[in-house]
Interface confidence: low
Amino acid sequence: WSSKVLMSSANEDIKADLILTSTAPEHLSAPTLPLPEVQCFVFNIEYMNCTWNSSSEPQATNLTLHYRYKVSDNNTFQECSHYLFSKEITSGCQIQKEDIQLYQTFVVQLQDPQKPQRRAVQKLNLQNLVIPRAPENLTLSNLSESQLELRWKSRHIKERCLQYLVQYRSNRDRSWTELIVNHEPRFSLPSVDELKRYTFRVRSRYNPICGSSQQWSKWSQPVHWGSHTVEENPSLFALEA
């Protein structure tokens, strides 16, 4: 599939509807405490973690998480089967690959089992919440005497779904040069100085063809090319995290 024009909808709005359900009118004497917001991220389309700040609860409460997809044959919520804990209190849920459907609205409900009327429902667009693995297998090759090509690989995600940020600098540079590479896991540097030592690194995000995720992956392991003869003050040129 190819995209002629990128979509102009409000896709960045990942926290679509936040519906806080309060007590029925006849029980309004004590206001219902808001529940913490649930944040979900899909890690490399291998699993998803939905987490919340359990320490925001005034007293230790094992909140429960239920989820479903907006359009599905079975419209009932299912409870999390793999809770994450913080100090022995539920603070998240891990959902496995088989239950991830990127292109349906994911409806997630957080509930206080002690007070069933205290619940919050959020709708999330999972294709905007994908965080890929860091690119791997960075390799450098000479296309010509002064031209370098950098290639890399991404695991489990189609390359056409990813956008890459390449950073490089020489041992003479105080800052990185960076550029965006769309969909092709390669980059060529037309002119390199063989007396310099270059460092390259890459990260990726699930954007813009298959999703609109703003979250970058971690940086790849850096790779180096060039002369080791030119020494500079290493403290000036240490890699940033």
Epitope: W1, L6, S8, S9, A16, Q104, I209
Partner: nanobody, 134 residues
Framework: QVQLQESGGGSVQPGGSLRLSCAAS????????MGWFRQAPGKEREGVAA????????YYADSVKGRFTISQDNAKNTLYLQMNSLKPEDTAMYYC???????????????????????????WGHGTQVTVSS
């Protein structure tokens, strides 16, 4: 609810053209993702083309790029698929599909970007048959 009704199918010789129409009724149409899918006998239903009516973005399967054109007439609530240079492998039942937007606090959010997956769509028509043979 949205109802979709396709028309315009038929038999045509290789190299010929057809224009499919899909009339949408029953709900607001302005912020839908609309798509055309096809299913040949014994094969999976596959995406052919899609258009996001809110922004005019269009998407095509590689196999039809340059030959098929998706368009819409919002005033008539109708989606079209202009099919040129038809080939025998285009023979299939053609379905119109629509995916509704989710209401978000910053406006409508369409829960789809590529238009490729069957599960992205909420509503389906009953199909119209296209046969390409000499």
């Amino acid at each position: 609810q949205v109802q979709l009704q396709e028309s315009g199918g038929g038999s045509v010789q290789p190299g010929g053209s057809l224009r499919l129409s899909c009339a949408a009724s029953g709900s607001t149409y302005a912020n839908y993702l609309m798509g055309w899918f096809r299913q040949a006998p014994g094969k999976e239903r596959e995406g052919v083309a899609a258009i996001y009516s809110g922004g005019g973005s269009t998407y095509y399967a590689d196999s039809v790029k340059g030959r098929f054109t998706i368009s819409q007439d919002n005033a008539k609530n109708t989606l079209y698929l202009q099919m040129n240079s038809l080939k025998p492998e285009d023979t299939a039942m053609y379905y119109c599909a629509a995916a509704s937007a989710v209401k978000g606090d910053k406006g409508d959010i369409v829960v789809v970007v590529t238009g490729t997956q069957r599960m992205e769509y909420d509503y389906w028509g009953h199909g119209t048959q296209v046969t390409v043979s000499s």
